[in-house]
């Protein structure tokens, strides 16, 4: 942004009424009037080029400094070419000197050269030669100097002529300000430019109405340079929740729109399954029956719990049940569906029921399932089981109702065979078993597993379709662990107890005696 100039002194605009002091009085500098474009113009001129050893001073009136720290002095002047005078005027000069003096009071006509400090020698870029002068075509020079820092209440400028032919047409003294500025939704006040060229004055901005510094963001700051220009913007403001940027202001979201946080983004239209929002909304409320989970962004449509799993089947396989289901027909608008399986067992003889989580085994943890099947094992024969599969999503916890489907199954796994030792010898064991007659038709074979007691590394297996077997080639006076298991179309039935049977010792009499 361009600097703003505040004028403290403008000779050209004063119309010759400033009454500057000349020294020596009545000599040297003189106020003259000319007509240019039918307008009177005033100038101070001096042209004692022939006289040698000139020391003519022109002092401005006392200028009140105000808040200025550094002043800028713009001079418009003409200088005649020394060669345009007869004999080249050996004492003729083509420059003049610019001075200033600070003071806390106006000295009036009391002029003291020693109080003044030289600012610079002012030399023209172009001099006015004879031909130009005769053609009334003077070359106007513009020079600018600056002084600072100033500390007293006011100051004077003075112009020292040392033998030049000079006309001073304009003296303009001003200081610079960084103008009031709106940038990045922050307001920066008008600020006086600093006095030291390398330093930049840091200025804090204030957020415009309904704008805020974002969390973790930097406060808005800018730097006011010596020349009155704003530089190096830092930080910014953003329109707060419920407001969006329109040009350099924050405007409330229109009805039906919302903005949930301070950001650069515009207001968004309310998502699906929300109620129309009022002006300046930070979110849109959900329609009845729809919800927003705590972690859901405000831009996401409101959702609802899923319906129950669509189909649920329970397929019994011996002491196992495979539960399969299909996803809910209505997901509630969410993708984070999980399933929970619970189990209830009922004793047929008493009709009493209770949870069975402690006594069954699931193929994977039964809560938070993402797959649509699970196998439940270790079910007890002749027990009635009811399995409940509940579908849940991220908003299910916000309602009391549950979405579930149930399936019941009776376990008709074969009973464990009842095993007996029928006979034994020193090298053999005759074993028989029985299962209830209604179950016998389901069994296609029996598997007999046996091993020496104390030898857990090796075991033997015999399969038979009958209800007895003789285990041969055994060691005398040795205990064997024997187990019988029914094999059915559904897999293995329940295994019998592990029994301990002992062969006879060699001195034991009577073969196959029990």
């Amino acid at each position: 942004a361009q600097g703003k100039e505040v004028v403290l002194l403008d000779f050209a605009a004063a119309g010759g009424e400033l009454g500057w002091l000349t020294h020596p009085y009545g000599k040297g500098w003189d106020l003259m009037q000319n007509i240019m474009n039918d307008m009177p113009i005033y100038m101070y001129s001096v042209c004692n080029v022939m006289s040698g050893d000139q020391d003519n001073w022109l002092r401005t009136n006392w200028v009140y400094r105000g808040e200025a720290e550094r002043i800028f002095i713009e001079l418009k002047f003409t200088v005649r070419d020394c060669n345009s005078f007869p004999g080249g005027a050996s004492s003729c000069k083509e420059t003049f000197n610019l001075y200033y003096a600070e003071s806390d009071l106006d000295y009036g006509t009391n002029f003291q050269k020693r109080l003044f400090t030289k600012i610079d020698t002012i030399a023209p870029d172009e001099i006015t030669v004879s031909s130009d002068f005769e053609a009334r075509h003077v070359k106007l020079n513009v020079e600018e100097r600056s002084v600072g820092p100033l500390t007293r209440k006011g100051f004077y400028l003075a112009f020292q002529d040392i033998g030049a032919c000079v006309a001073l047409l304009s003296v303009r003294v001003y200081y610079k300000k960084c103008p009031e500025l709106l940038q990045g939704l922050a307001h920066f006040p008008e600020t006086i430019a600093g006095s030291d060229a390398p330093s930049l004055a840091t200025v804090a901005g204030t957020c415009v109405d309904h704008a805020v510094v974002p969390p973790g963001g930097e406060e808005p700051r800018m730097h006011c340079a010596v020349d009155g220009e704003w530089l190096v913007p830092i930080g910014q403001c953003l329109c707060q929740a419920g407001y969006e940027k329109v040009e350099d202001a924050c405007q409330a979201c229109s009805p039906g729109f919302f903005k949930f946080e301070a950001s650069e983004s515009p207001c968004l239209e309310c998502p699906e399954h929300t109620l129309p929002s009022p002006e300046g909304a930070t979110s849109c409320e959900c329609e009845e029956g729809f919800f927003r989970a705590p972690q859901d962004p405000a831009s996401m449509p409101c959702t609802r719990p899923p319906s129950a799993p669509h189909y649920l089947t329970a397929v019994g396989m011996g002491a196992k049940v495979e539960l399969r289901w299909t996803p809910p027909q209505d997901s509630g608008g969410r993708e984070d569906i999980v399933y929970s399986v619970t189990c209830e067992q009922c004793w047929p003889e008493s009709g009493e029921c209770g949870p069975c989580e402690a006594s069954v085994r699931y193929s994977e943890p039964p809560h938070g399932l993402t797959r649509t099947s699970v196998t439940v094992s270790d079910l007890e024969p002749h027990m009635n089981y009811t399995f409940t599969v509940e579908a849940r999503n991220g908003v299910s916890g916000l309602v009391t109702s549950r979405s579930f489907r149930t399936a019941s199954v009776s376990i008709n796994q074969t009973e464990p065979p009842k095993v007996r030792l029928e006979g034994r010898s020193t090298t053999s064991l005759s074993v028989s078993w029985s299962i209830p007659p209604p179950q016998q038709s389901r069994v296609w074979k029996y598997e007999v597993t046996y091993r020496k007691k104390g030898d857990s590394n090796s075991y033997n297996v015999r399969r038979t379709e009958g209800f007895s077997v003789t285990l041969d080639d055994l060691a005398p006076d040795t205990t064997y662990l024997v187990q019988v298991q029914a094999l059915t179309q559904e897999g293995q039935g329940a295994g019998s107890k592990v029994h301990e049977f002992q062969t006879l010792s060699p001195e034991g009499s009577g073969n196959l005696a029990v």
Epitope: P416, L421, R424, L429, K453, G454, S456, T479, L481, Q483, A494, G495, S496, K497, V498, H499, E500, F501, Q502, T503, L504, V514
Partner: antibody, heavy 130, light 108 residues
């Protein structure tokens, strides 16, 4: 009806040897596996080990966690069996029980390892403290 | 080694049925025995071989065993049934007696 009567020192210092004896009255002694079981204060039951005297041979079986310190012996002439536990510490403070299994170990070729304990001694509180 | 897991406590109102479970891998293949122990007394055998009762034990005590769970059922519970209950099996792999951790039955 079988009865079990047990006795032994009730207060020991660390590193000493615990010694308990259990007498069997009113029933057969041979053919059974006789067990020792203990119960630390406020805790559950822990099986220590068992012994069976058959013919002239003693068959012992001990809990692996105590095996290095335990000895169970039998005196068939007195129908008694004994427990010795060496190098005791405060962790061995418990009520110690002797126990009889429900059935003889093997009858007609059918054996019952780890049978149910139908008769228990009255228990002996053993405290190990310095 | 073989582990038997029992719930630490079970509560039941008088007249109701209490069920105390004992879980162990393939426990159905083993004979399970149950003991009742009242404070300051030696344990008493109440069920052996899964479901048999010794003489003198009332028929309100019954047991079952299949798969990985054995259950002691006490029907028509009375205040006098308040005690600790332990299950026990023989582990054929290690040839050792194993007890469950015990369950405290509280009659409300």
């Amino acid at each position: 009806q079988v009865q079990l009567q047990q006795w032994g020192a009730g207060l020991l210092k660390p590193s000493e040897t615990l010694s308990l004896t259990c007498a069997v009255y009113g029933g057969s002694f041979s053919g059974y596996y006789w067990s020792w079981i203990r119960q630390p204060p406020g805790k559950g039951l822990e099986w220590i080990g068992e012994i069976n005297h058959r013919g002239s041979i003693n068959y012992n079986n001990y809990n692996p966690s105590l095996k290095s310190r335990v000895t169970i012996s039998v005196d068939t002439s007195k129908n008694q069996f004994s427990l010795k536990l060496s190098s005791v510490t405060a962790a061995d403070t418990a009520v110690y029980y002797c126990a009889k299994p429900l059935r003889p170990h093997c009858t007609n070729g059918v054996c019952y390892s780890g049978d149910a304990f139908d008769i228990w001694g009255q228990g002996t509180m053993v405290t190990v403290a310095s | 080694s073989y582990v038997l897991t029992q719930p630490p406590s079970v509560s039941v109102a008088p007249g109701q049925t209490a069920r105390i479970t004992c879980r162990g891998n393939n426990i159905g293949s083993k004979n399970v025995h149950w003991y009742q122990q009242k404070p300051g007394q030696a344990p008493v055998l109440v069920v052996y071989d899964d479901s048999d009762r010794p003489s003198g034990i009332p028929e309100q005590f019954s047991g079952s065993n299949s798969g990985n769970t054995a259950t002691l059922t006490i029907s028509r519970v009375e205040a006098g049934d308040e005690a600790d209950y332990y299950c026990q099996v023989w582990d054929h792999s290690s040839d050792h007696v194993v007890f469950g951790g015990g369950t405290k039955l509280t009659v409300l």
